[in-house]
Interface confidence: low
């Protein structure tokens, strides 16, 4: 028996295309629309549950609904990693898993989903109003994050399927090329739709068997971007016994290769020093956000002007690719 909560889905209306377009004419728009939706708006889902047998034990499950290659997953407590959250675990598909108290067990469930068990007793247990966030760094989609917490009722046994809640990172420098193509396609699609808008015809009902008919996930690009931009992060605020800080992992995380901006994530700071040349210099904690590597902290006097990267035990090959992805 367990208590579960999921972040609410951003459910778009099903697109109804007006106009008397023939089936052939529809193929391109539907393909473009599919591209705009599936490639342009990957999603992250978060599921938080409290074990009824052990009320101080939480399980967080997160997954990435996208076609890209995941290069890093960060689970944080208390809000998004870049906005005050503190890291509980970092999972890298090749370089291993690091976790901190009160995280007990972090693991990959599938190639695109992870789970994390948090333990605690008394003062050190996570509270039901704690927000847990999962951030997926992937290529070519970039960084996507979603957050969730337990519902106010916290009734053991409450269960629902996990639902996606995307966050748009509009400044992903590493995917400008892909974005440009998609943007062009989306604009072209809108142009086609507008051109045929005033032609009277019955509303199109996409065929269930048609590969060009994405249903639940097919939402217009404008809706997608607006919804994502207007939701800085999806979270449910709940209440329970007074929250404790004993569950926090300090300032966000480990000294992993190219990881997350932790130092700047918890205090208002000046802009991070950005470096675009992936040259390993010394171990440090840097960001893969936006396809660039951000040095997360002051550079010691002996460190050169190059990028501060974690020296990967597997050698220089580990640093290939825009996000360390080969």
């Amino acid at each position: 028996m367990r208590t579960e909560a999921q972040v609410p889905a951003l459910q778009p209306p099903e697109p109804g295309l007006e106009g008397a377009m023939g089936h052939r004419t529809l193929v391109l728009p539907w393909v473009l629309l599919t591209l705009c939706v599936t490639a342009g708006t990957p999603e992250v889902w978060v599921q938080v549950r409290m074990e009824a047998t052990e009320l101080s034990s939480f399980t967080i499950r997160c997954g990435f609904l996208g076609s890209g290659s995941i290069s890093l997953v960060t689970v944080s407590w208390g809000g998004p990693n870049g906005a005050g959250g503190t890291t509980l675990a970092v999972l890298h598909p090749e370089r291993g898993i690091r976790q901190w108290a009160p995280a007990r067990q972090a693991r990959w469930e599938t190639q695109s989903s992870i789970s994390l068990i948090l333990e605690g007793s008394g003062a050190s247990s996570p509270c039901a109003n704690t927000t847990f966030c999962c951030k997926f760094a992937s290529f070519p989609e970039g960084s996507w994050e979603a957050c969730g917490s337990l519902p106010p009722s916290s009734d053991p046994g409450l269960s629902a399927p996990p639902t996606p809640a995307p966050i748009l990172r509009a400044d992903l420098a590493g995917i400008l090329g892909v974005s440009g193509v998609l943007l062009f396609g989306c604009v072209y699609l809108l142009h086609l739709l507008r051109r045929h808008k005033h032609r009277p015809a019955p509303r199109l009902q996409p065929s269930r068997t048609s590969p060009q008919a994405p249903r639940a996930r097919a939402w217009a690009p404008s809706q997608a971007s607006q919804a994502a931009l207007h939701v800085p992060y999806a979270t449910i605020n709940t209440s329970c016994r007074p929250a404790t800080l004993d569950t926090a992992h300090p300032h966000g995380g480990p000294s992993w290769w190219a990881s997350l901006p932790t130092h700047a994530a918890h205090r208002p700071q000046g802009p991070a020093a950005w470096a675009s040349t992936p040259i390993p210099a010394r171990g440090s904690f840097v960001s893969v956000e936006n396809g660039l590597y951000a040095q997360a902290g002051e550079r010691p006097p002996h460190t050169g002007p190059g990028l501060t990267l974690f020296p990967d035990p597997r050698g220089p090959r580990a640093m290939e690719g825009p996000l360390g992805v080969r």
């Epitope: 370089r95 108290a101 004993d246 926090a248 300032h251 904690f285």
Partner: antibody, heavy 119, light 107 residues
Framework: EVQLQQSGPELVKPGASVRISCKAS????????MHWVKQSHGKSLEWIGY????????GHNQNFKSKATLTVDKSSSTAYMEFRSLTSDDSAVYYC????????????WGQGTSVTVSS | DIQMTQSPASLSASVGETVTITCRTS??????LSWYQQKQGKSPQLLVY???TLTENVPSRFSGSGSGTQFSLKINSLQPEDFGSYYC?????????FGGGTKLEIK
């Protein structure tokens, strides 16, 4: 210059509690973990736990979870460790150590506080 | 918890010699390992972090190597000030643990 100044030696009775302080200077106190380490006479080092001054978040070695309480006073840039229910096994030198925010290293250590538990 | 096995427990060497201290971990800790030097009655001093990165102002005769579960600290051309105790420590998540230490004495 980064400095961690610990409180002086303590002689306490079994069953009592002791509170050790570690005053930090020369850096932004809330930006770094503060760790506590125990060293019994002639023995190795034992990690007790850490506190992150920015939000009070802590992590403990389970062996010390019921024994040590870690707190900070941000206004004075001071970290505290309270040790309770002391026994002769708790007689040791206790160090505070700053850990850089990338979790790479404990780069600065206090001079140590000697605690002797004796009746 | 990750166990740290440091060897040898004690070591006698002469000035000018080269010595190597090893540290083995029970689990893969990648390169999340530090080496400390401690003199009698003093606090530990960080020598090496991330397995092989030398701390500022530490002489280049010290060098760290290894990854995964096997690590070593090498001291070339021992100097009188190098004698003392050495400890390895992992920082691959909590709880951090230290090795049992190596006491380096003058022969």
């Amino acid at each position: 210059e980064v400095q961690l100044q610990q409180s002086g030696p303590e002689l306490v009775k079994p069953g009592a509690s002791v509170r050790i302080s570690c005053k930090a200077s020369g850096y932004t106190f809330t930006d770094y973990n503060m760790h506590w380490v125990k060293q019994s006479h002639g023995k190795s080092l034992e990690w007790i736990g850490y506190i992150y001054p920015y939000n009070g978040g802590t992590g403990h070695n389970q062996n010390f979870k019921s024994k040590a309480t870690l707190t900070v006073d941000k206004s004075s840039s001071t970290a505290y460790m309270e040790f309770r229910s002391l026994t002769s096994d708790d007689s040791a030198v206790y160090y505070c150590a700053r850990e850089d925010f990338r979790h790479e290293k404990m780069d600065y250590w206090g001079q140590g506080t000697s605690v002797t538990v004796s009746s | 918890d990750i166990q740290m096995t440091q060897s040898p427990a004690s070591l006698s060497a002469s000035v000018g010699e080269t010595v190597t201290i090893t540290c083995r971990t029970s689990d893969n800790i990648y390169v999340y390992l530090s080496w400390y030097q401690q003199k009698q009655g003093k606090s530990p001093q960080l020598l090496v972090y991330n397995a092989k990165t030398l701390t500022e102002n530490v002489p280049s005769r010290f060098s760290g190597s290894g990854s995964g579960t096997q690590f070593s600290l090498k001291i070339n051309s021992l100097q009188p000030e190098d004698f003392g105790s050495y400890y390895c420590q992992h920082h691959y998540g909590t709880p951090y643990t230290f090795g049992g230490g190596t006491k380096l004495e003058i022969k």
